[in-house]
Interface confidence: low
């Protein structure tokens, strides 16, 4: 159906497994960025790994169901886990096409959700998911 949500799809080489079963991958003609049309939700997600002052994308794609947070228009990540010392996984959910391509800002790992706190920014014209 034409009203299906479309998200940016990306999986870092080191990520074990794939979420591509949650949608239909669209052949954009180039390797990056890739897009995925969601099968089970109208919600995109993004996962970034913040190490010191550098953010690297881990995964981007479709969520498997519409959950709280999916109503957000933009990707506003919140800290979720610490996979290793000095690094923090930030995740976002959002409910507009390609909303997971980038984030507005990352709060510092030590102060999750602090209003106005600014984490690493994308340089003008640079997409965060290209950090890899």
């Amino acid at each position: 159906p034409p009203n299906r949500r479309t998200c940016v799809f990306f999986e870092a080489p080191g990520v074990r497994g794939s979420t591509k079963t949650l949608g239909e991958l669209l052949d954009t003609g180039t390797e990056l960025p890739r897009a995925i049309r969601c099968l089970y939700s109208r919600c995109c997600f993004g996962i970034w790994n913040l190490t010191q002052d550098r953010a690297q994308v881990e995964m981007q794609g479709c969520r498997d169901s519409d959950e709280p947070g999916c109503e957000s228009l933009h990707c506003d990540p919140s800290p979720r886990a610490h996979p290793s010392p000095g690094s923090t996984l930030f995740t976002c959910s959002c409910g507009t096409d390609f909303c997971n391509a980038n984030y507005s800002h990352l709060p510092p790992p030590g102060s999750p959700g602090t209003p106005g706190s600014q984490g690493p920014q994308a340089a003008p014209g640079e997409s965060i998911w290209m950090a890899l």
């Epitope: 074990r16 497994g17 794939s18 979420t19 591509k20 079963t21 949650l22 239909e24 991958l25 052949d27 099968l39 089970y40 997600f45 996962i47 995964m59 794609g61 969520r63 498997d64 169901s65 959950e67 979720r80 886990a81 996984l89 995740t91």
Partner: antibody
Framework: QVQLVQSGTEVKRPGASVKISCRAT????????ISWMRQAPGQGLEWMGW????????NYAQKLQGRVTMTTDTSTSTAYMELRSLRYDDTAVYYC??????????????????????WGQGTTVTVSS | QPVLTQPPSASGTPGQRVTISCSGS????????VNWYQQVPGMAPKLLIY???QRPSGVPDRFSGSKSGTSASLAISGLQSEDEADYYC???????????FGGGTKLTVL
């Protein structure tokens, strides 16, 4: 230990339906998906589809769409595969396999394709008149 | 007709190294990881290699996998009689939105 135990041999008439069960033990059923494969006599493996035991999402092989239904019962840690309108060429050994681990909450229970790491013993289905 | 192409047979003597190839396309092996399964006659398949080159616990390090472009290969070194089996490669296929298998390679230990 981690095990998948399938239901027994079935003999069916053309046009009938068959429903095979696959009971999981030794792991948290809803943390994984289940894939179904089949193998016709003397032939290779064919993937039929998968179901997420976490939320019931399914993905069927295109050639079987409309004839196959996969379900799970988390209360009994059992997966089911029903194939309808059976034909002679559906005669095969049918396998269930644990497939794809869901994330630890970070990934919201999405399905990962990592290969099938635990297989059932197989169920022989013969379609014969 | 299997989507992934494997040689129907391979053979070797005990102690030898044998390689089994698996050829695909951009939509499967080209973009996705490859898994290998071993099936001893009359038994269910067993996961041998996942994510191109990872061995599940319990699989001897004599088995190794690799991938390059749209092809993959399984190497078995120090061949043993118990390695006699059918070997299948598999990968996710983006176009078919499903898992595809190779036709299988029957390995004979002479």
């Amino acid at each position: 230990q981690v095990q998948l135990v399938q239901s027994g041999t079935e003999v069916k008439r053309p046009g009938a339906s068959v429903k095979i069960s696959c009971r999981a033990t030794g792991y948290t059923f809803s943390d994984y998906g289940i894939s179904w494969m089949r193998q016709a006599p003397g032939q290779g493996l064919e993937w039929m589809g998968w179901i997420s035991a976490y939320n019931g999402n399914t993905n069927y092989a295109q050639k079987l769409q409309g004839r196959v239904t996969m379900t799970t019962d988390t209360s009994t840690s059992t997966a089911y595969m029903e194939l309808r309108s059976l034909r002679y060429d559906d005669t095969a050994v049918y396998y269930c396999a644990r497939d794809g681990r869901r994330g630890s909450g970070i990934y919201w229970g999405v399905y990962y394709y990592n290969g099938m790491d635990v297989w059932g013993q197989g169920t022989t289905v013969t379609v014969s008149s | 007709q299997p989507v992934l192409t494997q040689p129907p047979s391979a053979s070797g003597t005990p102690g030898q190294r044998v390689t089994i190839s698996c050829s695909g396309s951009r939509s499967n092996i080209g973009r996705n990881t490859v898994n290998w399964y071993q099936q001893v006659p009359g038994m269910a398949p067993k996961l041998l290699i996942y994510s191109n080159n990872q061995r599940p616990s319990g699989v001897p390090d004599r088995f190794s996998g690799s991938k390059s472009g749209t092809s993959a290969s399984l190497a078995i070194s120090g061949l043993q009689s118990e390695d006699e089996a059918d070997y299948y490669c598999a990968a996710w296929d983006d176009s078919l939105n499903g898992v595809v298998f190779g036709g299988g390679t029957k390995l004979t230990v002479l």
